[in-house]
């Protein structure tokens, strides 16, 4: 999960035409694991915005020291500032802490820009605005980082919710909600609903901002409207998914549906962007520029470079398509679609331009590892990371940013054969080199 | 090849509008590959820029003119127009029409300008 | 607002030698950024765009150098038609908004 666009600093390839839709489905969903209803203690636990990161409150050592931590499903490991550095206002002091315990190892963790190192160990850790719970956790503290922490963004760690085949240095070390299900008696499951602001703010009104809930344990009905769907996650490393077919205002890409997840496709809250492999990236645009061809903006405002601005308040959201994603399924041959408006892929930035004006730059960017879906897709929807159950829901948030011509949309289900093909098989290559930095 | 020439009122009265043409010739005011802007020149002072055109009709504004600029295209004519409401001696300029060029992000080519004076 | 700061405002300097003209730009600016130069009583010509690429017709005397914040155009050897005005213009924030306030080139 890294920067520019990956946060915190990765700001990172057949079958009958689809659009048949079967009779929608009359019974509930099936009941997921975990408390449902309410979890009053955790909403809008989350603060920050898009472009830097989602941050939880969380409390590190005996006696506990208050961090904020960016909330990253694109790694695996919880990572904590443990020495001085310009853009960190405190960090994590293991001499202070009496339940600090050393692991005698170190960690390195090279980014394409950038990278962090630090030394492990384990201490007490709990949640704040989460379950009332303390548990014992590996720790990674950063003594050393390039290009990771962002000046500004008020977080001084990251707590990776992905797979331990991801972590670092290797699947030996126990991730953080792995080490939370196994210490305690909440289930294995948590939601995130991450909410953009949708208009730029400042950076008094950004500190300010609630960002959005992170419900450990399962999930609240309070945060979504509708229905959820689920998605199988296909392999348990980052959160992988499979993509079906991508249309833009309902335009089919027709494309080889392997292209959509060349060489995976994951959801990665850690990344600012919805970034897609080079040859979906450059349909896609193709297909929003004609799209939106009434006006026409810059090479680099499409590179995610330069800021469009219009006068405040007349965003020309009608001018931009929707962008749909369908996921493969629960049910054989069965797919559902997510659909965003350009409220959540135009990515407001503040203090560029004059108060009189609104700018964005486009948050659709180019990848070279696979689709990720980031916060752009995210802010849409309330997704829930179902691990007991290996799949991933989504539903329309209840704060996602839309006008009163369009919302954001989680619809199905629609017939979608041969959808395993979709799915692009890794070669097998010395596990040394699979892991060479998430640009 | 392609020339840009303002015309219009060198004299304009104070609380009036001011009103200026620019011609295109040797090309297309339709290309899609341009847009098309305002941009003037106090005397002795700094370039100032006043707005944007796509062929399509789409403008774009400098915020601190908004409400007294308007810029409009007639195709048919090859011509794009601004008008300015509100005038006062601190309009007095030099206004240049342009053509934003090198996708969309550079003025590459210019008219020669247009002295246009505020006063009663 | 992104603010372009040139200078120095005035440039005293014979023919022949070379002149380093600087804007900086109040936040980065990527390398969106472009060099006009202009004659009295004509219009403004593009020399520079994105940073460092000439536009057409411009002799290679000419170059633009920089990206982030700090930029400089440098003219190699001045030429007795080079001495005029020059501005400099971002692009990062689209449309193209701000002009820096202007560099003059004199005859020493």
């Known amino acids: 999960t890294h920067l520019g666009i990956r946060l915190p600093l990765r700001s990172g390839l057949a079958g009958p035409p689809l659009g048949l839709r079967l009779p929608r489905e009359t019974d509930e969903e099936s009941e997921e694991p975990g408390r449902r209803g309410s979890f009053v203690e955790m909403v809008d636990n989350l603060r920050g915005k898009s472009g830097q990161g989602y941050y939880v409150e969380m409390t590190v050592g005996s006696p506990p020291q208050t961090l904020n931590i960016l909330v990253d499903t694109g790694s695996s490991n919880f990572a904590v500032g443990a020495a001085p550095h310009p853009f960190l206002h405190r960090y994590y002091q293991r001499q202070l802490s009496s339940t600090y315990r050393d692991l005698r190892k170190g960690v390195y963790v090279p980014y394409t820009q950038g990278k962090w190192e630090g030394e492990l160990g384990t201490d007490l850790v709990s949640i704040p605005h989460g379950p009332n719970v303390t548990v014992r956790a590996n720790i990674a503290a950063i003594t050393e980082s390039d290009k990771f922490f962002i000046n500004g963004s008020n977080w001084e760690g990251i707590l990776g919710l992905a797979y331990a085949e991801i972590a670092r240095p290797d699947d030996s070390l126990e991730p953080f909600f792995d080490s939370l299900v196994k210490q305690t008696h909440i289930p294995n499951i948590f939601s995130l609903q991450l909410c953009g602001a949708g208009f730029p703010l400042n950076q008094t009104e950004a500190l300010a901002s609630v960002g959005g809930s992170m419900i450990i344990g399962g999930i609240d009905h309070s945060l979504y409207t509708g229905r959820l769907w689920y998605t199988p996650i296909r392999r348990e490393w980052y959160y992988e998914v499979i993509i079906v077919r991508v249309e833009i205002n309902g335009q089919d890409l027709k494309m080889d549906c392997k292209e959509y997840n060349y060489d995976k496709s994951i959801v990665d809250s850690g990344t600012t962007n919805l970034r897609l492999p080079k040859k979906v990236f450059e349909a896609a645009v193709k297909s929003i520029k004609a799209a939106s061809s009434t006006e026409k903006f810059p090479d680099g405002f499409w590179l995610g470079e330069q800021l469009v601005c219009w006068q405040a308040g007349t965003t020309p959201w009608n001018i931009f398509p929707v962008i749909s994603l369908y996921l493969m399924g629960e049910v054989t041959n069965q797919s559902f679609r997510i659909t965003i408006l350009p409220q959540q892929y135009l990515r407001p930035v503040e203090d560029v331009a004059t108060s009189q004006d609104d700018c964005y730059k486009f948050a659709v960017s180019q990848s070279s590892t696979g689709t990720v879906m980031g916060a752009v897709i995210m802010e849409g929807f309330y997704v829930v990371f179902d691990r007991a159950r290996k799949r991933i829901g989504f539903a329309v948030s209840a704060c996602h940013v839309h006008d009163e011509f369009r919302t954001a949309a989680v619809e199905g289900p629609f017939v979608t054969a041969d959808m395993e093909d979709c799915g692009y098989n890794i070669p097998q290559t010395d596990e040394s080199t699979l892991m060479t930095g998430r640009a | 090849q392609l020339q840009l020439q303002e015309s219009g009122p060198g004299l304009v009265k104070p609380s009036e509008t001011l009103s200026l043409t620019c011609t295109v010739s040797?090309?297309?005011?339709?290309?899609?590959?341009?847009?098309w802007g305002w941009i003037r020149q106090p005397p002795g002072k700094g370039l100032e820029w006043i707005g944007n055109i796509y062929y399509s009709g789409s403008t774009y504004y400098n915020p601190s003119l908004r409400g007294r600029v308007t810029i409009s295209v007639d195709t048919s004519k090859n011509q794009f127009s601004l008008k300015l409401s509100s005038v006062t001696a601190a309009d007095t300029a030099v206004y240049y029409c342009a053509r934003l060029g090198h996708g969309y992000n550079y003025f590459d080519l210019w008219g020669r300008g247009t002295l246009v004076t505020v006063s009663s | 607002e992104i603010v372009l700061t040139q200078s120095p405002a005035t440039l005293s300097l014979s023919p022949g030698e070379r002149a380093t003209l600087s804007c900086r730009a109040s936040?980065?600016?990527?390398?969106?950024l472009a060099w006009f130069q202009q004659k009295p009583g004509q219009a403004p010509r593009l020399l520079i765009y994105?940073?460092?690429n000439r536009a057409t017709g411009i002799p290679a005397r000419f170059s633009g150098s920089g990206s982030g914040t700090d930029f400089t155009l440098t003219i190699s050897s001045l030429e007795p038609e080079d001495f005029a005005v020059y501005y400099c213009?971002?692009?990062?924030?689209?449309?193209?908004?701000?002009f820096g306030g202007g560099t003059k080139v004199e005859i020493k």
């Open positions: 213009q971002q692009v990062y924030v689209w449309p193209p908004r701000t």
């Open positions: 994105d940073a460092s």
């Open positions: 040797g090309g297309s005011i339709s290309s899609s590959s341009y847009y």
């Open positions: 936040q980065s600016v990527s390398s969106y």
